[in-house]
């Protein structure tokens, strides 16, 4: 690995991450005469190490019988957290992750918080609100995003290697200028992250500096490196 010039930049045109909470002031959707079952499913990308707040459907507390959060994480038994208004009691089944909790006491706030989000929190979260008018659901397909670590180095004569290490989902790599590139390699890790590696060669001696651009849902990054001279090259034209 060369000591060559290496500069990191973070693009100003990053994708904006979803806010930490999808809870909003929504209009009351229940009507006293309604027997319609409202079901909403939301795909929600959340960056690892941030906090996330998941909300139940906007049902008035006076209409509630039971609030249930159902949490389905990969490779684990389904966890349920429930609150019965009549008895003011909460109950948990198969819930072992202490980072997933009620935001406050369920009689005050039915929202669920993940504090902080870990890679193992990928999964499906559903709030079921039982009322005399039927059950109202809101589900979240939570996709945990992991920012890849980006490295760039010159491996041999005018050949550069750019790696986006342990990102989730897999990052995309492009080059300025375009080089003669080997097929992109992907290495999958047990925790769901992916390392992407791109190796390119530049024959033209007028290429001075190459830029590796990494695109990812958590934001874009670029690194650039001035190519070293080919060994044995003493004098060259431009």
């Amino acid at each position: 690995q060369s000591n060559n010039s290496l500069m990191l930049q973070t693009s100003k045109e990053n994708h904006t991450l979803a806010s930490n909470s999808l809870c909003m002031d929504e209009k009351q959707i229940t009507q006293n005469h309604s027997k319609v079952l409202a079901e909403v499913n939301i795909s929600w990308p959340v960056q690892m190490a941030r906090n996330a707040v998941l909300c139940c459907p906007p049902i008035e507390f006076r209409n509630l019988i039971v609030i249930t959060w159902e949490i389905i994480l990969r490779g684990q038994p389904s966890c349920t957290k429930s609150y019965r208004k009549e008895t003011n009691e909460t109950k948990e089944t198969n819930c072992t992750d202490e980072r997933i909790t009620w935001v406050s006491t369920p009689d005050q706030n039915s929202d669920l918080q993940i504090h902080p989000v870990a890679i193992t929190h990928d999964g499906y979260y559903r709030c079921i609100m039982a009322t005399p008018d039927g059950n109202f659901h809101r589900g979240y397909h939570l996709q945990v995003l992991v920012t890849p670590e980006v490295t760039l180095f010159e491996s041999r004569n005018r050949t550069a290697v750019c790696k986006a290490v342990a990102g989730k989902p897999a990052a995309q790599i492009s080059w300025i200028p375009a080089g003669d590139c080997a097929p992109t390699e992907q290495e999958y890790w047990g925790n769901g992250t992916v390392t992407v590696k791109s190796t390119c060669h530049w024959e033209g001696h007028n290429v001075s500096t190459v830029t590796c651009h990494v695109s990812h849902l958590t934001g874009n990054k670029s690194l650039y490196i001035e190519l070293l001279p080919v060994p044995g090259a003493k004098k060259s034209a431009k």
Partner: antibody, heavy 114, light 107 residues
């Protein structure tokens, strides 16, 4: 921190030559290209060429091939640029640059005058 | 050689204004570049590296962006001390080439 030291000015006669110096410190001198740039009063910047101290490899813009010669002295971490057959057109500020354009010397003002 | 076309060559603006200038590579060449500020009698100072990365110590009112092969330098709220000449440098191909510069005057 990275520093590039250049003399403030050089006064030379037409037809003569001058050797400009650029002393580097604060980084691994032999691992980074050094570039030279020319700026005439009130005008834009022109790239003259570059040298890689680790191997003495040089590149020159076509326009400066018969004007400039770049050399390096590893022991003093200094890059030199020799400019020959000077005319009034060569009166300018000459900058040395490293780290892919991030660091610049303060520039040497070359005045060609009888 | 890659020509860098910079516009405008000069502009006059008032304090607090939003100011933009652009650099474009000839023939739509895909390049990377830096933005510099130069004041009279001084060496150029790197403001934005690699098209969009704000250098340490540079006020956050400066920003750089890229759209295809067009690069833009924006000053979000002009201050007195911003009166200077600004230019871009493409460092992807040899020879490195500079934009012609934008001379910024305060009205």
């Amino acid at each position: 921190q990275v520093q590039l030291q250049q003399p403030g000015s050089e006064l030379v006669r037409p037809g003569a030559s001058v050797k400009l110096s650029c002393k580097a410190s604060g980084y691994t001198f032999t691992s980074y290209w050094m570039h030279w740039v020319k700026q005439r009063p009130g005008q834009g910047l022109e790239w003259i060429g570059n040298i890689f101290p680790g191997s003495d490899t040089t590149n020159y813009d076509e326009k400066f091939k018969s004007k400039a010669i770049m050399t390096v002295d590893i022991s003093s971490s200094t890059v030199y640029m020799h400019l020959s057959s000077l005319t009034s057109e060569d009166s300018a500020v000459y900058y040395c640059i490293t780290y892919t354009g991030a660091y610049w010397g303060q520039g040497t003002l070359v005045t060609v005058s009888a | 050689d890659v020509q860098m076309i910079q516009s405008p060559s000069s502009l006059s603006a008032s304090m607090g204004d939003i100011v933009t200038m652009t650099c474009q590579a000839s023939q739509g060449t895909n390049i990377n570049l830096h933005w510099f500020q130069q004041k009279p009698g001084k060496a150029p100072k790197l403001l934005i590296s690699g098209g969009s990365n704000l250098e340490d110590g540079v006020p956050s009112r400066f920003s750089g962006s890229r759209y295809g092969t067009d690069f833009t330098l924006t000053i979000s709220s002009l201050e007195d001390e911003d009166m200077a000449t600004y230019f871009c440098l493409q460092f992807t191909y040899l020879p490195w080439t500079f934009g012609g510069g934008t001379k910024l005057d305060i009205k």
